[in-house]
């Protein structure tokens, strides 16, 4: 069967949204009116994995981008990159596990840590313009809460 | 400063393999891609694969698959391929490159090539 | 895959002139807005050499007599004043979707 997916953005609890700046980079900024179409639509794949009722398995996708969120050790700490994928075999429901996130759901905000490297999360800065990045520590000065907005295929 | 030296020159007969090696240094080898391209005599370039030391990952273009084969000694920083069936077309220049960022970025650095000659 | 149409095959022109060079991929190479175009220049018995990156960013060391332009499927190199040096093969490589590949070059020789 084909693998489950959906469509959404994500902006951290700043309400920062993610964009594309540059080819090989995405940034939290915050975003108003017409600038909102900047912002990149994930496509949301629901993998294999370890599950449980408030954590699901996931790979993040660049929407017909084949681009992925891929987590690889650099300079000996985990680190957050895009990767390229083909398109005839992605998404697929067993993902190679640097593309797997655990979605966790706490207070109806999102967190995504990387089943490569637990506790590592998908993290933004408090400052505007800045990378979305890999962070090993939660509650901190970087945000890693997240909401997701749906959008139609 | 960054470098990638590859191994020398090569002749086959058609049926044989090869294995080209490309030597990293100045760098954090686990830390990028490595990608193949060849070039036939005379003819534009032709990209291979590519394998990430850091985690032995691999993207192979469909052209080759079954017959290459990347891997990647993370104690010498080298990275090889190899190349199995080997024949008459397969007479190219083979470089070892390195994408600026993961599997997809634009190429800054290369090896000098190795000229591998298939000839009964 | 995506298929790179480069030309013109040959380009004869001399030193202190300006070269345009295209480049027409078969489908759109852009993602996010930006060009996912790459370009390089290669001299006889030597490896490429990057002159620009996402299809207007110049190449770390290069003069600033080359520039790039183009979205969606087609592309351009420009060489604004033609050097010696500067004649050699040229390659656009994109780097959108897998498998990467190159056109087949432009020639740019002395006339």
């Known amino acids: 069967a084909p693998v489950r997916s959906l469509n959404c953005t994500l902006r951290d609890s700043q309400q920062k949204s993610l964009v594309m700046s540059g080819p090989y980079e995405l940034k939290a900024l915050h975003l108003q009116g017409q600038d909102m179409e900047q912002q990149v639509v994930f496509s949301m794949s629901f993998v294999q994995g370890e599950e449980s009722n408030d954590k699901i398995p996931v790979a993040l996708g660049l929407k017909e981008k084949n681009l992925y969120l891929s987590c690889v050790l650099k300079d000996d700490k985990p680190t957050l990159q895009l990767e390229s994928v083909d398109p005839k075999n992605y998404p697929k429901k067993k993902m190679e596990k640097r593309f797997v996130f655990n979605k966790i759901e706490i207070n109806n905000k999102l967190e995504f840590e990387s089943a490569q490297f637990p506790n590592w999360y998908i993290s933004t800065s408090q400052a505007e313009n800045m990378p979305v990045f890999l962070g090993g520590t939660k509650g901190g000065q970087d945000i890693t809460d997240f909401t997701m907005q749906f959008v139609s295929s | 400063q960054v470098q990638l030296v590859q191994s020398g020159a090569e002749v086959k007969k058609p049926g044989a393999s090869v294995k080209v090696s490309c030597k990293a240094t100045g760098y954090t080898f686990t830390d990028y891609w490595i990608a193949w391209v060849r070039q036939a005599p005379g003819q534009g370039l032709e990209w291979m694969g590519s394998i990430f030391p850091g985690g032995d990952y691999t993207n192979y273009n469909e052209k080759f698959k079954g017959r290459v084969t990347m891997t990647r000694d993370t104690s010498t920083s080298t990275s090889y391929m190899e190349l199995s069936s080997l024949r008459s077309e397969d007479t190219a220049v083979y470089y070892c490159?390195?994408?600026?960022?993961?599997?997809?970025?634009?190429?800054?650095?290369w090896g000098q090539g190795t000229l591998v000659t298939v000839s009964s | 895959e995506i298929v790179l149409t480069q030309s013109p095959a040959t380009l004869s022109l001399s030193p202190g002139e300006r070269a345009t060079l295209s480049c027409r991929a078969s489908?759109?190479?852009?993602?996010?807005?930006?060009?996912?175009m790459n370009w390089y220049q290669q001299k006889p018995g030597q490896a490429p050499r990057l002159l620009i990156y996402a299809a207007s960013n110049q190449g770390s060391g290069i003069p600033a007599r080359f520039s790039g332009s183009g979205s969606g499927t087609d592309f351009t190199l420009t060489i604004s004043r033609l050097e010696p040096e500067d004649f050699a093969v040229y390659y656009c490589q994109q780097n959108k979707e897998l498998p990467w590949t190159f056109g087949q070059g432009t020639k740019l020789e002395i006339k």
């Open positions: 489908e759109s190479v852009d993602n996010s807005g930006i060009g996912f």
């Open positions: 490159a390195r994408p600026y960022y993961s599997n997809y970025g634009h190429f800054d650095y």
